[in-house]
Interface confidence: medium
């Protein structure tokens, strides 16, 4: 293919004064292949190379790659010539990275975290905005308050939760040591002593066919927050499940095709059949999301030999309802995470 | 196949804004700088800057610093070039092209009041 | 930047003649240049790259060579769909730059 100055940074380093030396010539035409494909080492793609003409072992990260010697596309690699630039002749397979994240107007650095106000921390990863709520969820005494309410505290950015009592004014839900930090404590306590936090899963990025699902975890050694994903797949974008409606009724909840069947991806298929459900739709406004569900690992086998296993969303129940939410509003589900395990994983 | 699919002409005012769209098909988005490209009619090419949607990097040729700015949108194999500040002199076809190989159609965009 | 001098801007040939367009480069670039072909309302078509590599499906009348920083784009046995404007292109140093190009005309 033809030379094209690599990545680099913004600034362009100039090339040396004086090369003498020719660009080497990495495909050759016509085509001179062996004469049977390579056997390729496990978890090591077997790819048509760059130049168009014969079957090779993709290149993996760390090594060199040529027009014609191409990085392993199934494990995110593209080939870096930023060593060699602007010559477009020789680089390095590196991993590809993430994109930065636009938020209110303000763009931000993939892997960068930041306060887009007092009540959360957020990190951009790969696209996608994850926030943390710095404001803990402490619970309401359930025993010896009849009325807890959650309510603004002047000069502090969490609320609180108060008892209202019919006798008299609101007041504070425990002392001070039973654990309602104020807002500064629990800043305090989610960085001293990292207090373990997964998010939830954000709804679906798509509301038919195959989407991503994503949620922020700080459970690892660095008490970092980083990002898992899972597909997901509401309802499939060809069947109108408008027309399986019964007669009388507004909506359908679950709806489960009769046959069992393959998940594909990318070219490669589910190792296993399954049969599942997925959520419906309603005639009026409500929206049908999913209400009972648990994350599965489903294992993928490729064309070329390459297995991969993705999580997958995998939906047991849903209901409909009317709080059909922006897609766009990020803290919609961090608002009102629901307490219920079954219904979150 | 290769293909390089670029958005339809635009007429602009001067001091606008413009955004073209490039969507790539047939090879590895992340594994390839889109480059963009103008001409003005009658006129040789001129190089605007290019984009590595694998490493997320960016360069822009010295004269369009601060007025081209270039993106992507890889869950949708798409490049895109914004020019702002457009002037009558902008007027040109605008080419993406994967690695200087494969070009688009090209994109014509009239800044004219 | 690196200024890339193309000539003739124009030339008059009938089919079957043998065509050389040259390329002068204001340092070196070592064989990084691309040769490509335009036709009116459509994008170039690269034809050579690395001075004198035949892009793949490129007939083989187009050949491209090389001495010190002077580039050479020959067609030999000029054919009805070669008359077109020709522009060669260094992808040595940022920014890219491109030749004025030369004008391939029916005589």
């Known amino acids: 293919t033809a030379l094209s100055p690599a990545p680099t940074t913004m600034d362009f380093t100039p090339a040396p004064l004086e090369d003498t030396s020719s660009r080497p010539q990495f495909c050759k035409w016509p085509c001179e292949c062996p004469p049977s494909p390579p056997r390729c080492p496990l978890g090591v793609s077997l790819i048509t190379d760059g130049c168009e003409c014969c079957k090779m072992c993709a290149q993996q990260l760390g090594d060199n790659c040529t027009e014609a010697a191409i990085c392993d596309p199934h494990r995110g690699l593209y080939c870096d010539y930023s060593g060699d630039r602007p010559r477009y002749a020789i680089g390095v397979c590196a991993q590809v990275v993430g994109v930065g994240c636009v938020l209110d107007g303000v763009r931000y650095n993939n892997g960068q975290s930041f306060q887009p106000n007092c009540k959360y921390n957020c990190t951009c990863i790969d696209g996608a905005v994850g926030c943390t709520p710095l404001c803990l969820r402490v619970r309401p005494p359930r025993l010896w308050c009849p009325h807890p309410r959650r309510v603004s505290i002047p000069g502090h950015c969490c609320e609180q939760w108060v008892c209202e009592d019919d006798a008299k004014r609101p007041r504070k839900t425990a002392p001070r040591d039973t654990g309602a930090f104020d807002a500064v404590g629990e800043v305090e306590a989610w960085h001293r002593n990292c207090i373990a936090y997964t998010s939830p899963w954000s709804p679906c990025s798509t509301s038919c066919g195959l989407g991503v699902s994503t949620r922020i975890s700080n459970v690892n050694a660095q008490c970092w927050p980083e990002q898992e994903s899972r597909l997901c797949n509401l309802r499939p974008c060809d069947v109108d499940i408008h027309t399986l409606i019964k007669a009388g009724k507004k909506c359908l909840a679950v709806y489960q095709p009769e046959a069992s069947m393959n998940f594909t991806l990318a070219g490669c298929i589910s190792t296993r059949s399954y049969q599942p459900k997925y959520c419906g739709v309603c005639m009026d406004n409500r929206c049908c999301i999913p209400y009972k569900s648990k994350t599965i690992d489903v294992s993928f086998q490729c064309p070329d030999g390459l297995g991969f296993s993705r999580q997958v969303l995998w939906i047991n129940a849903c209901f409909c309802n009317l709080s059909c939410r922006n897609p766009n509003d990020i803290f919609a589900d961090l608002e009102s995470y629901p307490d219920f395990s079954e219904i979150a994983n | 196949e290769v293909q390089l699919v670029q958005s339809g002409a635009e007429v602009k005012k001067p001091g606008a804004s413009v955004k073209v769209s490039c969507k790539a098909s047939?090879?590895?988005?992340?594994?390839?700088?889109i480059n963009w490209v103008r001409q003005a009619t009658g006129q040789g090419p001129e190089w605007l800057g290019w984009?590595?949607?694998?490493?997320?990097?960016?360069g822009n040729a010295q004269n369009f610093q601060g007025r081209v700015f270039m993106t992507w949108d890889t869950s949708k194999d798409t490049a895109y070039m914004e020019m702002s500040s457009l002037r009558s002199d902008d007027t040109a076809v605008y080419y993406c092209?994967?690695?200087?190989?494969?070009w688009g159609q090209g994109t014509l965009v009239t800044v004219s009041s | 930047d690196i200024v890339m001098t193309q000539t003739p801007s124009s030339l008059s040939a009938s089919v079957g003649d043998r065509v050389t367009i040259t390329c002068r480069a204001s340092?070196?670039?070592?064989?990084?240049l691309n040769w490509y072909q335009q036709k009116p309302g459509k994008a170039p078509k690269l034809l050579i790259y690395?001075?004198?590599s035949l892009q793949s499906g490129v007939p083989s009348r187009f050949s491209g060579s090389r001495s010190g920083t002077d580039f050479t784009l020959t067609i030999t046995n000029v054919q009805p769909e070669d008359f077109a404007t020709y522009y060669c292109?260094?992808?040595?140093?940022?920014?890219?730059?491109f030749g004025q190009g030369t004008k391939v005309e029916i005589k």
């Open positions: 092209a994967r690695n200087l190989d494969y």
């Open positions: 047939g090879y590895t988005f992340t594994s390839y700088d």
């Open positions: 984009l590595n949607p694998g490493s997320g990097k960016t």
């Open positions: 340092q070196s670039i070592s064989s990084y």
């Open positions: 690395a001075a004198s």
């Open positions: 292109l260094q992808a040595y140093d940022f920014p890219i730059t």
